[in-house]
Interface confidence: low
């Protein structure tokens, strides 16, 4: 329960706080769990304990392991565990999942990205910020204290943001980097029960035998980015992919966002070489999201030849 995962990169500073808290006056002893060896408190050591903090200055891959901290008071002892993993530096730009801190969301009104774990370090402004490994430049980006502010946030601002700063310990400087994902949400967004714009309920679609026919299922789900929204066709209550008729396929239409901001999806059902038996099927346009499912049913009828008699 009182275990904390911590990670860092080789040759960078890493500072870990004991997961068990206590008053500043309480003593904290640190041990390397695998050997039960006490971690020294002398600052001349590369790895040393400083009260509730365990400092790797700098960290090495071999430091990886579980560290035990015991908070001692006159009346009780509390034990915590720090699971520390030190990784080799990546040669490419990609930051793997295991080095990522928690994802944060922003919007037009609130676009602060806090630099993770920075409060544990002795650092001085300014922070350096990078997005997808590129240094951030331009007036839209402002490094302010321990966070980055992005003005006029757009969906394109989503991505992985890395903060870089210098930790100072007794006059020696150590680099620290930390990366987290930033997602952009539409502040004005909302979600509705799906509204199917086409086809109309119980619509009869006229088709010609031997020709191709297209049916479009179009539905809107609200405004802004929608969570778990989909449109699809079913034949006699069966998914197209499971129905097993290669002449009948569904194809993703364009994701639409109209001038009023509505988020809509299209799914086109393509029937090649329409056959008599296709007229017997029930075609269901389904639109679903977290609010529920709406279904509009279509049937096909043979297009009558033009009657030339008066």
């Amino acid at each position: 329960k009182f275990s904390k995962q911590s990670w860092g990169l080789e040759n960078e500073a890493l500072i870990v706080r004991c997961p068990r808290q206590g008053k500043p006056s309480y003593t904290v002893d640190w041990y390397y769990s695998q050997t039960n060896k006490s971690i020294p408190t002398q600052e001349r050591n590369r790895v040393f304990a400083s009260g509730q903090l365990l400092k790797f200055l700098p960290a090495a891959v071999a430091d990886s392991g579980i560290y035990t901290c015991i908070v001692r008071s006159p009346t009780f002892n509390r034990t915590g565990y720090a699971n520390v993993t030190i990784y080799k530096k990546q040669s490419d730009c990609n930051v793997p999942d295991y080095l990522m801190y928690s994802t944060v969301s922003g919007s037009e009104k609130n676009s602060k990205i806090y630099c993770p774990t920075i409060d544990l370090y002795n650092w001085t402004a300014p922070l350096e910020w990078f997005k997808n490994c590129q240094a951030l430049q331009g007036s839209r980006y402002r490094a302010h204290k321990s966070f980055l502010v992005i003005d006029n946030v757009m969906t394109e601002d989503a991505g992985d943001y890395t903060c870089k700063f210098i930790h100072n310990e007794n006059g020696a400087n150590y680099s620290v980097t930390a990366t987290r994902s930033f997602t952009v949400k539409d502040e004005q967004g909302f979600s509705l029960f799906p509204v199917i714009g086409a086809p109309a309920q119980n619509e009869i679609k006229e088709v010609e035998i031997g020709k191709n026919a297209n049916l479009t299922c179009s539905a809107c789900f609200g405004k802004g980015t929608q969570f778990l929204a989909a449109v699809l066709w079913q034949l006699n209550g069966t998914k197209i992919t499971d129905f097993g008729e290669p002449r009948i396929q569904q194809e993703e239409g364009q994701n639409q966002s109209f001038s009023n901001g509505l988020a809509c999806l299209d799914m086109v059902l393509r029937i090649a070489d329409v056959k008599e038996e296709d007229l017997l099927l029930q075609y269901d346009c389904l639109a679903l999201n977290l609010h529920g499912l709406r279904r509009h049913t279509v049937r096909l009828s043979r297009k009558n030849p033009i009657d030339h008699h008066s």
Epitope: T225, A230, V231, E252, N255
Partner: nanobody
């Protein structure tokens, strides 16, 4: 991910990616395959929405690569045929729960795999 490795130009490989969690959750994920060659940015290869079986492909792989899934196993596959040397890259699978951005232009996914290397020699 698994299934990476080396292949000759014109050969085939099949990558697989298994998502932990319930089948209910898996079927509602937008899932994608990405690749990143040394010194280049990450590019989308193919994306899929298992719940309705709809797929998208990058122009560079259309007709050669096929994305599919086994909903019972919570697993997504990328069948790569007619491989070319320019397909050499680290391949990543990704998953996200935001559907209406599930397309080949989507790059911000909540969950990423560790990557598997694909090397195609001429």
């Amino acid at each position: 991910e698994s299934g990476g490795g080396s292949a000759q130009a014109g050969g085939s490989l099949r990558l697989s990616c298994t998502a932990s969690g319930s089948g209910y959750f898996y079927s509602r994920l937008c899932m994608g395959w990405f690749r990143q060659a040394p010194g280049t940015g990450r590019e989308a290869v193919a994306t899929s929405y298992p719940g309705i079986g709809s797929t998208y492909y990058a122009d560079s792989v259309k007709g050669r690569f096929t994305i599919s899934q086994d909903n019972a196993k919570n697993t997504m596959y990328l069948q790569m045929n007619s491989l070319k040397p320019e397909d050499t890259a680290m391949y990543y699978c990704a998953a996200d729960a935001t559907w209406n951005t599930c397309g080949i232009t989507k790059t911000t996914y909540a969950y990423w795999g560790q990557g598997t290397q694909v090397t195609v020699s001429s």
